[in-house]
């Protein structure tokens, strides 16, 4: 069964900068990736970026840069000039589409005990939905 993993990191040098890493584990090629964000329990969500393998990427503030890392993983840099740790209670969701097989979503948030000095590269440990 295909799976999506999500990891949210606080940047060590900038407390107001975050990076969302997402990846797709499964067969098939990716036709579209959508990254969205909102409050807990699906409240107040909106899109941050859309990445198409041929048509390019679109992003919306506070997204700073969306890019492909591999053919099946992406990263999205976020920046907020407001209070430190502005995304602490935010949920980030990544949805990968593989046409015509289907699409899969997973969501994640900044770990509560995030220490910017301990930021590590993402490892593909799936944070999975029950479905």
């Amino acid at each position: 069964t295909p799976e999506v993993w999500v990891q949210v990191q606080m940047e060590a040098t900038e407390l107001s900068s975050f990076t969302v890493h997402c990846g797709f584990l499964g067969p098939g090629s990716i036709s579209l990736v959508t990254v969205s964000w909102g409050g807990p329990d699906g409240a107040g969500g909106t899109k941050l970026a859309v990445l198409h393998p041929e048509l390019g990427t679109r992003q919306w503030a506070p997204a700073r840069q969306a890019r492909w890392e591999t053919q099946s993983s992406i990263s999205l840099a976020l920046e907020d000039s407001g209070a430190s740790s502005p995304f602490a209670n935010t949920t980030f969701c990544c949805k990968f589409a593989s046409f015509p097989e289907g699409s899969w979503e997973s969501c994640g948030s900044l770990p509560p005990s995030s220490d910017p000095g301990l930021s590590a590269p993402p490892t593909p440990v799936p944070i999975l939905r029950a479905d």
Epitope: G42, G45, K47, H52, C93, S103, D131
Partner: nanobody, 127 residues
Framework: EVQLVESGGGLVQPGGSLRLSCAAS????????MSWVRQAPGKGLEWVST????????SYVDSVKGRFTISRDNSKNTLYLQMNSLRAEDTAVYYC????????????????????WGQGTMVTVSS
Amino acid sequence: EVQLVESGGGLVQPGGSLRLSCAASGFTFSYYDMSWVRQAPGKGLEWVSTINSDGGRTSYVDSVKGRFTISRDNSKNTLYLQMNSLRAEDTAVYYCVEGDPHNFGLENLSLRDFGSWGQGTMVTVSS
């Protein structure tokens, strides 16, 4: 896995009304823009309408403005399309999709350019 299941299609006379529904599951529905697209027999895919994640912003293709209304109920994970004053040229398979085709200014639409898609529901307008 994401699922989008359309319902409400059928045969209706010109001037009649139908309400299409799209039940969503497997993703955080309230975070995403949703659209309706349609494919008439022998024709390409055509964008019909889009609604943003909270339902506060909608847009329509010119040919359905004033006749069709898109809406959503995030508490029920459901997208709707109310179609009034139906015409023969509205005959098509209607698909519920996640995303907004204006993101990339797509002219030749394909279901593969959306984040999720349903199996479609047929609407036939005929006397």
